[in-house]
Amino acid sequence: SHTLPVRLLRPSDDVQKIVEELQSLSKMLLKDVEEEKGVLVSQNYTLPCLSPDAQPPNNIHSPAIRAYLKTIRQLDNKSVIDEIIEHLDKLIFQDAPETNISVPTDTHECKRFILTISQQFSECMDLALKSLTSGAQQATT
């Protein structure tokens, strides 16, 4: 079993690199999704993003985000999601609880779900990176 504290297993430069990669991939996903014309964002779906009661990077709701993106992957074959999931897994503890997502059945509603969650994921990664960098600045002052 592990003899080192968890934080020593994952230096902050790695975390920042992971989140930067996720931010870049989220933009790629959104660009891909936005190519579908005539689809509007829905108010019915909310992607959990940052938790106010945890320190970066544990403040990112990675398990829930993973579950939402896995759902999109099942609805629409976006291969970029495979890579996103691999990076999210670097932030998820092995014993993290599972998140259940209710999937829309209507085709048009599925498209709205995909667009809405993709947009929120992109915004979330921007916020996550900001919270990481501001956290790093606070740690050095």
Epitope: R10, P11, E86, I92, Q94
Partner: antibody, heavy 122, light 107 residues
Framework: QVQLVQSGAEVKKPGSSVKVSCKAS????????MQWVRQAPGQGLEWMGA????????RYSQKFKGRVTITADKSTSTAYMELSSLRSEDTAVYYC???????????????WGQGTTVTVSS | AIQMTQSPSSLSASVGDRVTITCRAS??????LAWYQQKPGKVPKLLIY???TSASGVPSRFSGSRSGTDYTLTISSLQPEDVATYYC?????????FGGGTKVEIK
């Protein structure tokens, strides 16, 4: 005590398929990636693919895409690697391996099966 | 795919020598690199994970380090039982490729 036990040696004809199993015991966590690796006689280690058993999510090496299928049966904690259209170059020892925590993504494979020798010969 | 270039492919050193093996990644992979030891006819054994963390039960003469995209496995004082082939493997994104291996022999 974590253990990975693989199925026994196989001798196969060219063009046929082989299915190797890997049973895990002593491990309670569900969020992890298991990998399959092979080693031809006198050669290095070659990554074939991986599976996330909790969901059956898979990743494959481009070299084996279309020929390899990795599956998992959660109820028996067993993973399988099936390789089809076998040729003599597929003669190798096939290993399954998986990591210790704390994260879902691996950064080293702590546990390895004993290896399964597959011989492809006419 | 990320390429892992391992060097040297083989080396011969005397007992007690300091031995270094290097793996260079074709792009930044952070600390997502492992080192394995494989003795002839045996299963690979994890030595180092996360670039520089020793696996349980690994002798202290084995250590890992990183400089940018270069990763080094060092055996501080080579022992007869260290005769083996050593491999690196990255885990940044699939495919999780291996280095070509370094065969270590005793002079």
């Amino acid at each position: 005590q974590v253990q990975l036990v693989q199925s026994g040696a196989e001798v196969k004809k060219p063009g046929s398929s082989v299915k190797v199993s890997c049973k895990a015991s002593g491990y309670t966590r569900t969020r992890y990636w298991m990998q399959w690796v092979r080693q031809a006689p006198g050669q290095g280690l070659e990554w074939m693919g991986a599976i996330y058993p909790a969901e059956g999510d898979t990743r494959y090496s481009q070299k084996f895409k279309g020929r390899v299928t990795i599956t998992a049966d959660k109820s028996t904690s067993t993973a399988y690697m099936e390789l089809s259209s076998l040729r003599s170059e597929d003669t190798a020892v096939y290993y399954c391996a998986f990591p210790e925590g704390p994260y879902a993504a691996p950064y080293g494979m702590h546990y390895w099966g004993q290896g399964t020798t597959v011989t492809v010969s006419s | 795919a990320i390429q892992m270039t391992q060097s040297p492919s083989s080396l011969s050193a005397s007992v007690g020598d300091r031995v270094t093996i290097t793996c260079r990644a074709s792009r930044n992979i952070g600390n997502y690199l492992a080192w394995y030891q494989q003795k002839p006819g045996k299963v690979p054994k994890l030595l180092i994970y996360y670039a520089k963390t020793s696996a349980s039960g690994v002798p202290s003469r084995f250590s890992g380090s990183r400089s940018g995209t270069d990763y080094t496995l060092t055996i501080s004082s080579l022992q007869p039982e260290d005769v083996a082939t050593y491999y690196c493997q990255h885990f940044w994104k699939t495919p999780w490729t291996f280095g070509g291996g370094t065969k270590v022999e005793i002079k």
